[in-house]
C-alpha cells in the first residue's frame, strides 16, 4: 500500500507510517514500528505534559518564586502545569501573572481611592482642601479636617493636604 | 534542559520587514512568555515586546507602530516581525523566557545588520 | 514617557573594592526592580530580582535596595570576575518593561 502523508488526530507521521502520539501526563520512549506500537512512559514527579504529544522530555513544572512575590494557587499534575498568584499584599505585572510586586502607597498628601487587589494596584488620588493624609499607606484615605467649632475651639493653624488643622481656645474677653 | 534559540537574517536592507524567529525547548509557551530585547554594538539593553503565557502581546511605545509579536505553542515558536528596518535597528536581538517580569532565560542573540 | 536612569554611566574600581550603583524611575514601580550583569559577546545575566533579592546560584557580595523610585546594586567587595557591564530592569508593568542605560565596571 502506498505510504500515507498525513495521519489521523492523535498520530504522527514518522518514517512513512503513522504512530500514536503519547497522552497527555505521558512522554514518547520510542516510536512505533511497522510491529511494535508508540512506547511512551508517565511523566516524574514535579514534571508534565498537557497535549497530545511526541516529546522526549516533560516539562518542569512551574516554579512560583516568593522573590517575585508569588505563591502556588493550584498544585501541578502530570498533565497541568502549577498555577501562581500573588502573595497577600503583591500584585500581578500583568495578565499573565509571570512575577508581582508590592502594592504601592499612597504617599502624604494622598489617600486611597481604590484598595489594591490580587491583579489590580492601589489607586491614589490627593487630598482635596477639607481633607489630609499625613502617613504613606496603603490602605488610609484623606481623613477630613478637624472641625475646631463642634469642640468649642478655634483653629490655630490652618490645615493642608499633609496636616491636620491646630485647634486652640478661643480668646476670653477679660472683663 | 531549557533553550531558546534565534534565527533569522543576518542582513536587512533599509525600508525591509525583519522577521526573527525564536525557537524554545524544555518549557511549553501555555505556561510561560517570551519576550524580545536588542542591544545596539556597544549601546545598552532595549526591551522590544512580550507576549504572556496567556498569549496577551505587549510592545515598547516607542516601537509599537513597528512591531508584532506572535507565537505558535505546537511549534515552541515566538515571531517578532519588525517593519521599515533602518541602520539604527542594527544590533543584536536576544529572545528571553517571560513576558511582563524578570528574564533569568535568555538565547545566544542574533546580530541583524541593516544596510543597502 | 517612562524613564530608568543609570548611573555613573562607567567607573573604575580596584578588586576589593565596595562598589554602588544606582537606578532612578521617573515614576513609582513598588518593588519592581532587578539588575542584570553582562560580559561580552554574552546574554546578560540576572543578579537580583524584586530589588533586593539574590537570583538564584548569585554570589552574596551583591545586594540589592531601594522601593519606589531609587533603587541601588552594591557589590561588597568587587572580584576579578565582576568586571563587566551592569543593567537595571523595571518590570512593574507593560508600559513601564525598561532597561536602564548600563554602568560599566572597569579595572583601575
Known amino acids: 500500500p502506498e505510504p500515507p502523508t498525513a495521519c489521523r488526530e492523535k498520530q504522527y507521521l514518522i518514517n512513512s507510517q503513522c504512530c500514536s502520539l503519547c497522552q497527555p501526563g505521558q512522554k514518547l520512549v520510542s516510536d512505533c514500528t511497522e510491529f511494535t506500537e508508540t512506547e511512551c512512559l508517565p511523566c516524574g514527579e514535579s514534571e508534565f505534559l498537557d497535549t497530545w504529544n511526541r516529546e522526549t522530555h516533560c516539562h518542569q513544572h512551574k516554579y512560583c518564586d516568593p522573590n517575585l512575590g508569588l505563591r502556588v494557587q493550584q498544585k501541578g499534575t502530570s498533565e497541568t502545569d502549577t498555577i501562581c498568584t500573588c502573595e497577600e499584599g503583591w500584585h500581578c505585572t500583568s495578565e499573565a501573572c509571570e512575577s508581582c510586586v508590592l502594592h504601592r502607597s499612597c504617599s502624604p498628601g494622598f489617600g486611597v481611592k481604590q484598595i489594591a487587589t490580587g491583579v489590580s494596584d492601589t489607586i491614589c488620588e490627593p487630598c482635596p482642601v477639607g481633607f489630609f493624609s499625613n502617613v504613606s499607606s496603603a490602605f488610609e484615605k484623606c481623613h477630613p479636617w478637624t472641625s475646631c467649632e463642634t469642640k468649642d475651639l478655634v483653629v490655630q493653624q490652618a490645615g493642608t493636604n499633609k496636616t491636620d488643622v491646630v485647634c486652640g481656645p478661643q480668646d476670653r474677653l477679660r472683663a | 534542559e531549557v533553550t531558546l534559540k534565534e534565527s533569522g537574517p543576518v542582513l536587512v536592507k533599509p525600508t525591509e520587514t525583519l522577521t526573527l524567529t525564536c525557537t524554545v525547548s524544555g518549557f511549553s509557551l501555555s505556561s510561560y512568555g517570551v519576550s524580545w530585547i536588542r542591544q545596539p554594538p556597544g549601546k545598552a539593553l532595549e526591551w522590544l515586546a512580550g507576549i504572556g503565557s496567556d498569549g496577551s502581546a505587549y510592545y515598547a511605545s516607542w516601537a509599537k507602530s513597528r512591531l508584532t509579536i506572535s507565537r505558535d505553542t505546537n511549534l515552541k515558536q515566538v515571531v517578532l516581525t519588525m517593519t521599515n528596518m533602518d541602520p539604527v535597528d542594527t544590533a543584536t536581538y536576544y529572545c528571553a523566557r517571560g513576558g511582563i517580569t524578570v528574564y533569568a532565560m535568555w538565547g545566544q542573540g542574533t546580530l541583524v545588520t541593516v544596510s543597502s | 514617557a517612562f524613564q530608568l536612569t543609570q548611573s555613573p554611566s562607567s567607573l573604575s574600581a580596584s578588586v576589593g573594592d565596595r562598589v554602588t550603583i544606582t537606578c532612578q524611575a521617573s515614576?513609582?514601580?513598588?518593588?519592581?526592580l532587578a539588575w542584570y550583569q553582562q560580559k561580552p559577546g554574552k546574554p546578560p545575566k540576572l543578579l537580583i530580582v524584586?530589588?533586593?533579592n539574590l537570583a538564584s546560584g548569585v554570589p552574596s557580595r551583591f545586594s540589592g535596595s531601594g522601593s519606589g523610585t531609587d533603587f541601588t546594586l552594591t557589590i561588597s567587595s568587587l572580584q576579578p570576575e565582576d568586571f563587566a557591564t551592569y543593567y537595571c530592569?523595571?518590570?512593574?508593568?507593560?508600559?513601564?518593561?525598561?532597561f536602564g542605560g548600563g554602568t560599566k565596571v572597569e579595572i583601575k
Open positions: 530592569q523595571s518590570y512593574f508593568s507593560s508600559s513601564s518593561t525598561v
Open positions: 524584586g530589588a533586593s
Open positions: 515614576q513609582s514601580i513598588s518593588s519592581g
